[in-house]
Amino acid sequence: EPPTACREKQYLINSQCCSLCQPGQKLVSDCTEFTETECLPCGESEFLDTWNRETHCHQHKYCDPNLGLRVQQKGTSETDTICTCEEGWHCTSEACESCVLHRSCSPGFGVKQIATGVSDTICEPCPVGFFSNVSSAFEKCHPWTSCETKDLVVQQAGTNKTDVVCGPQDRLR
């Protein structure tokens, strides 16, 4: 009776279990009753990083110098190239597809540490009593205005993104 499931590193085709190609190799032809799976190594600047039945290898990532990228680790037949940014620049994501001088902290967050050549901007949420209503790469969270010191009262509470709104005290008649 033909199998309905195969072992690890195998795949089911034409009611038959065939071996997958190992990382670094692509599928040329499926196995038959009489022959093994035929695999071929990936070419230069290509890779496959899993046991597979792919008929085409993936192209290594290109670290585009026009985007500030350079090769951190050269790809092999089993691994993709890893890009990083030129010195002093920072990757915009884990995949490092583009570079920025530094990132800004969004409203509601303040700058805890300004970027350096080795570390990007470190942001922190504005705690109660502080706010930031701007996107900035250098501004800290600002304290809410103290209405009391201006002989005013709070008319609208502050948030992490907005200052308090002060207004005149109600005078007793």
Partner: nanobody
Amino acid sequence: EVQLLESGGGLVQPGGSLRLSCAASGFTFRDYEMWWVRQAPGKGLERVSAINPQGTRTYYADSVKGRFTISRDNSKNTLYLQMNSLRAEDTSVYHCAKPPFIFGDWGPGTLVTVSS
């Protein structure tokens, strides 16, 4: 298209002064925080100074505090850096930059050489 063009660099003796300008176009200048960044020959980038959109808040690297002053004229779409008491270690190419600070999204820079 965003364009930033720095000018005002040159050769100056230690202790001297220079005023750099950065002419901005292709974006609403008054809406953006702006930065001056410098790169000395064979060295990494140094973030020198920054100013908020309204020109009311500023940042200075410790290495330039008390000597450099950043300012802006939103009516002229221009950023400035007044540099006093210049030292040999201030020799660099100075660039202005705007958010989101994407690589290559800045001008060619202006070279400041401090030497006797």
